[in-house]
Interface confidence: medium
């Protein structure tokens, strides 16, 4: 195909076997560097697209994607990644080949995806497509869906990246009641990527694969609803797309909507309006504002105004890095054996967290629920009243968060006794940690009520078995004298338990166990 420019796509790996390239079906490990990525031309209506072999990079690896062009003369170029334009500085080597490079250092999951290089030369215009996969320690990946405007039409495209390829669906609700949260009759599902019907009360796009399900809600201000008690806040990271919808209903068409950022009207081309009549002949208008790739200067108060409704605002905060805000201090709880109780963590985070509850090397599903004030809450109730340490673990692309909980179950002591030649000892579990008394059984005290005040040594919590503390108490023989019956008692708020020991015996010889509640 002689009219196509001769180009070469190369992978330069900055680490031994840190990355590999090949067709998605069978990745080859990189040993040498650089490596030819076998750019293959695909003719498309928009021009020629060269597709490089898929590159697989180990997490934290560093690579350079490079295109070498045999065609001499001036050239200009532009890298595009996740709909953000990145600078491009071509240079020429000693053989007068045009060289365009993109270095990707300390790769993380967020840098996985398609890198498009648009090249304009005197000979031709064309695009080179690199696909970079991060060899994640997780088996599967599922990224939160995001929105894009369809070219030349007022419709939303929902995009989700993941391995395996996620299926995408729109979940729409037209009810103002709680039923939107449930699998209620007001909820409609559309398993397609493009949505033209943008008037619903609640619009979200959900993506699902083997890893689970992730959803993104179209942020909406409804001028017919009373404003929230706290100003709604929307977080985004630099480079992400911003979508914010204003919705209003009026008795007739005689009203207009406008978006302003910090009292300045949004630029033409960064919003579009749609109108429709509802069944009762009222007019519904929506005004969708969007920024395909946000920067720090897109931060601020976005206000939707109407000629017939009170205006409402939302604060959009653009972050360099995601976050998880919550109190990480350890919490300890004490409950009865059959008491209903849930651990809970209240947090604010962006991007949305992945979380789990962990107990004793087993993990339990973590559900998050959004609160009115912009915070979220996760509760864990399925502890089956087992004592021990519970962990809430959350992570997103940029942050990790851990919170530890200790659950103690109130329990009456249960005493085990043991006697040796020199001492008698008793141990007991139970919570709260039991206190000890030793009593002498004699002619004077047949009911064993005479307390032994000396020679007793108490040792607290010497081991912790599955969250159960064990306490022990030892009686020195010389203090008590041989040939005696003694009684050790452990007591706490849940009751008392005693064991009687014959002190003459060298081995374990408890023969009476009393349980006094």
């Amino acid at each position: 195909n002689q009219d196509l420019p001769v180009i070469k796509c190369v992978l330069i790996s900055h680490e031994n076997n840190g990355s590999s390239a090949g067709k998605p079906s069978s990745y080859r490990m990189v040993r040498g560097s650089p490596e030819d990525l076998q750019c293959t031309p695909r003719r498309q209506s928009e021009g020629t697209v060269y597709e490089a072999a898929t590159v697989e990079v180990a997490e934290s690896g560093s690579i350079t994607l490079q295109v070498q062009l045999a065609t001499p003369g001036d050239l200009s170029c532009l890298w595009v990644f996740k709909h953000s334009s990145l600078g491009c500085q071509p240079h020429f080597d000693l053989q007068n080949r045009g060289i365009v490079s993109m270095a990707i250092l300390n790769v993380t999951e967020t840098q996985a995806g398609e890198y498009l290089l648009h090249i304009q030369s005197e000979a031709a215009n064309y695009t080179v497509l690199f696909t970079v996969n991060v060899r994640d320690t997780q088996l599967y990946v599922l990224r939160r869906p995001y929105f894009r405007k369809m070219e030349n039409q007022d419709a939303l495209l929902c995009i989700s990246e993941g391995v395996p390829e996620p299926t995408v669906e729109w979940v729409l609700c037209s009810s103002h009641r709680e039923s939107c949260k449930e699998e209620g009759p007001a909820v409609v599902r559309k398993e397609e990527k493009v949505l033209h019907e943008l008037f619903g009360t609640d619009i979200r796009c959900c993506a699902r694969n083997a890893l689970g399900r992730e959803s993104t809600k179209l942020f909406t201000i409804d001028l017919n609803q009373a404003p929230q008690s706290t100003l709604p806040q929307l977080f985004l990271k630099v480079g992400e797309p911003l979508w914010i919808r204003c919705k209003a209903i009026h008795v007739n068409h005689g009203f207009g909507l406008t978006w302003e950022l910090e009292d300045k009207a949004l630029e033409e081309g960064s919003y579009f309006e749609m109108s429709t009549y509802s069944t009762n002949r009222t007019m519904i208008r929506i005004l969708l504002a969007f920024v395909s790739s946000v920067g720090r200067n897109d931060t601020g108060y976005y206000t939707c105004s109407s000629s017939k409704h009170p205006s409402q605002s939302a604060l959009v905060t653009i972050l360099e890095k995601g976050f998880i805000n919550a109190t990480s201090s350890q919490e300890e709880y004490e409950i009865d054996p059959y008491e209903k109780f849930c651990f809970s963590v209240r947090f604010k985070a962006y991007p949305r967290i992945r979380c789990t509850w962990i107990f004793s090397q087993a993990s339990f599903p973590c559900e998050q629920r959004g609160l009115e004030d912009g915070y979220s809450i996760s509760k864990f109730c399925d502890h089956k009243n087992k004592p021990g340490e519970y962990i809430f673990y959350a992570e997103n692309d940029d942050a990790q968060f851990t919170k530890m909980f200790t659950l103690n179950i109130r329990k009456k002591p249960q005493v085990l006794a043991n006697a040796s030649a020199s001492q008698a000892s008793c141990s007991s579990d139970g919570y709260p940690l039991p206190s000890w008394t030793w009593k002498k059984c004699s002619d004077k005290s047949p009911n064993c009520t005479e307390e032994i005040p000396e020679g007793v040594w108490n040792k607290k919590a010497n081991r912790k078995v599955f969250g159960q503390w064990v306490s022990s108490s030892t009686l020195n023989m010389s203090e008590a004298g041989k040939g005696l019956l003694v009684k050790c008692c452990a007591y706490n708020s849940m009751g008392t338990s005693c064991e009687t020991i014959f002190l003459n015996s060298p081995g374990p010889f408890p023969f009476i166990q009393d349980n006094i509640s």
Epitope: A58, E59, T137, Q138, L139, A210, T356, I358, F359, S360, Q361, A362, S363, F364, P365, D382, E389, I391, Y393, E395, Q400, T402, M404
Partner: antibody, heavy 121, light 108 residues
Framework: QVQLVQSGAEVKKPGSSVKVSCKAS????????ISWVRQAPGQGLEWMGG????????TYAQKFQGRVTITADESTRTAYMELSSLRSEDTAVYYC??????????????WGQGTLVTVSS | EIVLTQSPGTLSLSPGERATLSCRAS???????LAWYQQKPGQAPRLLIY???SRATGIPDRFSGSGSGTDFTLTISRLEPEDFAVYYC?????????FGQGTKVEIK
């Protein structure tokens, strides 16, 4: 790719202790659970316990409670399993295995090559 | 603890045949936290399926897992010569983790 490399075979006397190490190379270490699994000759797999190094939380199977100690050193990316009061029936191949999910526990997707511990007088 | 019982103990089949292995739990397995492993003589186990039905990286699609609650199945649609091995199920949803006793798939 993560690899787990275990210490070499051991021959021990009854009543003594053995400490097997498991060193991770590549990938993240601290936030992934490490399990210890043993397999006696001709027998099935038996889970002994595990640790999530980042949390320092350790869990032991009831059968091994009091005899096994599992630890981890994040600085050297190494997990250890120590079994005391050895008996002849502890003769087995001991495997360390890494969980597939960060920060939680999942199935064990990466395994060490195994360490044969022989207990014999 | 949850006891896992695998059946049959041994499965004698020819290459190309379909293998169905069963794993039954004494109590419901939390959130389908059930895995299947393959082990060949002298080798460490290899993860095939996790979450009852998700295939691990690099596992051929002839291996599939299904089930929830207390009954789980591993199916090998067409046995290849390299599939003859011992298969173990493991639950990791309730402490302590437990394994089934194994099913040996041997050549008939």
């Amino acid at each position: 790719q993560v690899q787990l490399v275990q210490s070499g075979a051991e021959v021990k006397k009854p009543g003594s202790s053995v400490k097997v190490s498991c060193k991770a190379s590549g990938g993240t270490f601290g936030s992934y659970g490490i399990s210890w699994v043993r397999q006696a000759p001709g027998q099935g797999l038996e889970w002994m316990g595990g640790i999530i190094p980042i949390f320092g939380t350790v869990t032991y199977a009831q059968k091994f409670q009091g005899r096994v100690t599992i630890t981890a050193d994040e600085s050297t990316r190494t997990a250890y399993m120590e079994l005391s009061s050895l008996r002849s029936e502890d003769t087995a191949v001991y495997y360390c295995a890494r969980d597939s999910w960060s920060g939680a526990t999942g199935a064990s997707d990466t395994w060490g090559q195994g360490t044969l511990v022989t207990v014999s007088s | 603890e949850i006891v896992l019982t695998q059946s049959p103990g041994t499965l004698s089949l020819s290459p190309g045949e379909r293998a169905t292995l069963s794993c039954r739990a004494s109590h419901s397995v939390s959130s389908s936290y059930l895995a299947w492993y393959q082990q060949k003589p002298g080798q460490a186990p290899r993860l095939l399926i996790y979450g009852a039905s998700s295939r691990a990286t690099g596992i051929p699609d002839r291996f599939s897992g299904s089930g929830s609650g207390t009954d789980f199945t591993l199916t090998i649609s067409r046995l290849e010569p390299e599939d003859f091995a011992v298969y173990y199920c493991q639950q990791y949803g309730s402490p302590p983790r437990t394994f089934g006793q194994g099913t040996k798939v041997e050549i008939k």
